[in-house]
């Protein structure tokens, strides 16, 4: 602890100029004071001034008022500093002396004589308020005040609490009257060394080194560090934890950059046609009658459906068509005949049958002929009977289908499975495609038949097809192909347009 006992001498009265021994001072009592402060004693005794002592220069002769003086000789109030915890009790002895000698240092002069002394014993709390008192004896009167205050940086009831304001990285505070710390704005903690971060700054994901700051930990962003950072390159995805890439609806792939809902996002099909998604960035437009083209953007000729019957010729008009009928026929589609069986309308040996009481007829055609008048030779390939790209060939009264590799049957409708002979090595999965089998290889193998064991960089062998980008390190001992527009599959080997149920995600 550390503090100061302060004594303010105010007035001393010795009207007769007498000493304590009854003698008078000549020419007057040149008065100085000795003060002794010590621990509380019920009976004041001689001995060391345990709390301190001080002497004044000559302050006046006989009776005088003592002026406040803050420096130099004759300082008033008198200061008695102490370096211990103030006990709250004390004993004080104030002696008035006459000196015949030096005004400034009377203590050292010989022949000093006691004028009077007073003793005060009691309790005194630390505080700024002066306690005023007056002591009389038969010859003299002394008026004085005293108090105990703490030294700079000491606080509390006994001046025992040290506190120094500071504003550095070991504390940002001022001191309260009781010596406790009062944190400067923006700081908290026992020693006011913890900054108060920006209001709302996430407790786990953000921190600060000075007030009103919010520094994000790795993987987090935003003013309050409450937004995760998705995987680098994540296009149409979000995260709930850092480095995630959870795809938005309609998007797929490692970076959510493959459009699974091209129809909704881009509306590519025109003229009221129906759009069907078929894998990333793939779609099919089903046109309404009268339209064609990849996006149904092309209007068909109104005559394309061959609406004119009985050999009538069709002419396109702005929003319609017109049938030019051959002789003997009439109607919008040349569907009505003016001929009867008497006109021998049936060609190629067709036999005529009258209808509607002889007002019209119908031809029954011999084999290999057709048409309302048996005028057309039958082309058995017209109906495209051959499936899976088979070629149709007319062979006299019949026709045959010449099938493409991998297909068989009368109409090439039967698929010959290339996978039946298990061409994929090392547990690869086989897929039958038009151009033959394709193998999807397990981790650690590559090649068209999974015959190549990967012993180093999985991407070194160029496993990704169709210009896809290969990534390694994203899954153990493996690679990931990021497919270009229009291709899917673990190696991007499948063009868009495969059945939707076909597996394409790596």
């Amino acid at each position: 602890g550390s503090g100061i006992f302060q004594l303010r001498l105010q007035e001393f009265v010795n009207q007769r100029g007498m000493l304590a021994n009854g003698q008078s001072c000549e020419p007057g009592c040149r008065t100085f004071f000795r003060i002794c402060l010590k621990h509380f004693q019920a009976t004041f005794s001689e001995g060391p001034c345990t709390f301190g002592n001080v002497s004044t220069p000559v302050l006046g002769t006989n009776s005088f008022v003592v002026r406040d003086k803050n420096s130099g000789s004759g300082r008033n109030p008198l200061q008695l500093p102490f370096n211990f915890t103030w006990p709250g009790t004390f004993s004080l002895n104030i002696q008035a002396w006459h000196t015949p000698g030096d005004d400034l240092r009377p203590e050292t002069s010989p022949g000093n004589s006691l004028i009077s002394q007073i003793i005060i014993q009691g309790s005194l709390a630390v505080g700024k308020i002066w306690r005023t008192d007056e002591q009389n004896d038969t010859l003299t009167r002394l008026s004085y005040s005293y108090r105990v205050i703490c030294s700079d940086n000491y606080y509390g009831e006994s001046c025992s609490r040290l506190c120094k304001k500071r504003d550095d990285h070991f504390g940002h505070y001022e001191c309260q009257p009781d010596g406790s710390l009062s944190c400067l704005p923006g700081w908290t903690g026992k020693y006011c060394d913890q900054p108060i971060c920006l209001s709302g700054c996430h407790e786990q994901n953000g921190y600060c080194s000075k007030p009103d700051e919010c520094i994000c930990r790795p993987g987090w962003q935003g003013r309050l560090c409450n937004e995760c950072i998705p995987h680098n390159g994540c296009r149409h995805g979000t995260c709930s934890i850092p480095w995630q890439c959870a795809c938005d609806e309609g998007w797929g792939g490692l970076f959510c950059d493959q459009d699974l809902n091209y129809c909704t996002h881009h509306s590519p099909c025109k003229n009221g046609s129906t759009c069907s998604n078929s894998g990333p960035k793939g779609y099919t437009c089903t046109c309404l009658p009268g339209y064609t083209g990849e996006h149904c953007e092309l209007g068909l000729s109104k005559c394309a459906s061959n609406p004119c019957r009985n050999g009538g010729s069709c002419k396109d008009q702005e929003n319609s068509y017109h049938c030019l009928c051959p002789p003997g026929y009439y109607g919008q589609h040349c569907e009505h005949s003016t001929l009867t069986c008497a006109d021998s309308p049936c060609f190629n040996g067709g036999s005529c049958r009258e209808r509607n009481q002889g007002s019209s007829y119908a031809c029954e055609c011999p084999p290999n002929f057709t048409g309302s008048n048996c005028e057309k030779k039958v082309d058995r390939c017209t109906s495209n009977p051959c499936a899976n790209g088979g070629q149709c060939q007319n062979r006299g009264p019949s026709r045959t289908c010449r099938c493409r590799p991998g297909f068989t049957g009368t109409h090439c409708e039967l698929h010959i499975s290339d996978c039946a002979r298990s061409p994929c090595a090392h547990g690869g999965t086989c897929h039958d495609l038009e151009n033959g089998p394709v193998c999807t290889c397990p981790a650690g193998f590559s090649g068209r038949r999974c015959e190549v064991r990967i012993t180093h960089d999985a991407c070194a062998s160029g496993p990704c097809f169709n210009g896809a980008t290969c990534y390694t390190g994203l899954s153990p001992n493996n690679f990931v192909c990021n497919c270009p527009y229009g291709f899917v599959g673990s190696r991007c080997e499948f063009p868009v347009g495969l059945p939707p149920s076909f597996p394409w995600v790596a």
Partner: antibody
Framework: EVQLQESGPGLVKPSETLSLTCTVS??????????WGWIRQPPGKGLEWIGD???????YYNPSLKSRVTISVDTSKNQFSLKLSSVTAADTAVYYC??????FGGGADSWGQGTLVTVSS | SYELTQPPSVSVSPGQTASITCSGD??????VSWYQQKPGQSPVLVIY???QRPSGIPERFSGSNSGDTATLTISGTQAMDEADYYC?????????FGSGTKVTVL
């Protein structure tokens, strides 16, 4: 009881960068109650404070060395490091790492044993 | 830059009191720490915040600080107290050490 151990090359060539690491054991470097400092002492001379850092990476440097000093912390390894660039013979000293306690008003209550770094070609 | 000044040396007889001063501008407004360093050893904190002793430091070590001067007092000095003593304070955000005082026990 916390212990600090300095490590790094004992000889550095002039104009190069001095690099030292202090490994903390027996306590976590991630405590908010401490700063982790570097102090040096040239042979036969007094102590010179270089700088310090806390667990979140807030650094404070001696103004006379600031342009050449970098202090960093690696909480996962319980280590902090000193880099002093463009060294000269005047940087030859015993380099100490120390723990400065907030509760001690910044007093360094734990020290490493020190490592002598000589700058010479 | 802030400077702390110490006397280069102080001599004391065994059992007597040694006082080491450390002076700096308005030093009494700052907290002062004192370190003891014996030859070939790392410094040891003996006083922090002007007058506080860490656990394990003998009671004969005491400190005070007011005005422009801080003082480390070793009462009843022993031969084992012979060492270099450094004062340290914080100026703004930087640590500052005194020049050091060699205490010799006669």
């Amino acid at each position: 009881e916390v212990q600090l151990q300095e490590s790094g090359p004992g000889l550095v060539k002039p104009s190069e960068t001095l690099s030292l690491t202090c490994t903390v054991s027996g306590g976590s470097i991630s405590s908010g109650s401490y700063y982790w400092g570097w102090i040096r002492q040239p042979p036969g001379k007094g102590l010179e404070w270089i700088g310090d850092i806390n667990y979140i990476g807030s650094t404070y440097y001696n103004p006379s060395l600031k342009s050449r000093v970098t202090i960093s912390v690696d909480t996962s390894k319980n280590q902090f490091s000193l880099k002093l660039s463009s060294v000269t013979a005047a940087d030859t000293a015993v380099y100490y790492c120390a723990r400065e306690a907030v509760s001690f008003g910044g007093g360094a209550d734990s020290w490493g044993q020190g490592t002598l770094v000589t700058v010479s070609s | 830059s802030y400077e702390l000044t110490q006397p280069p040396s102080v001599s004391v007889s065994p059992g007597q009191t040694a006082s080491i001063t450390c002076s700096g501008d308005r030093l009494g407004d700052k907290y002062v720490s004192w370190y003891q360093q014996k030859p070939g050893q790392s410094p040891v904190l003996v006083i922090y915040e002007d007058s506080q002793r860490p656990s394990g430091i003998p009671e004969r070590f005491s400190g005070s600080n007011s005005g422009d001067t801080a003082t480390l007092t070793i009462s009843g000095t022993q031969a084992m107290d012979e060492a270099d003593y450094y004062c340290q304070a914080w100026d703004m955000e930087a640590g500052v050490f005194g020049s050091g005082t060699k205490v010799t026990v006669l």
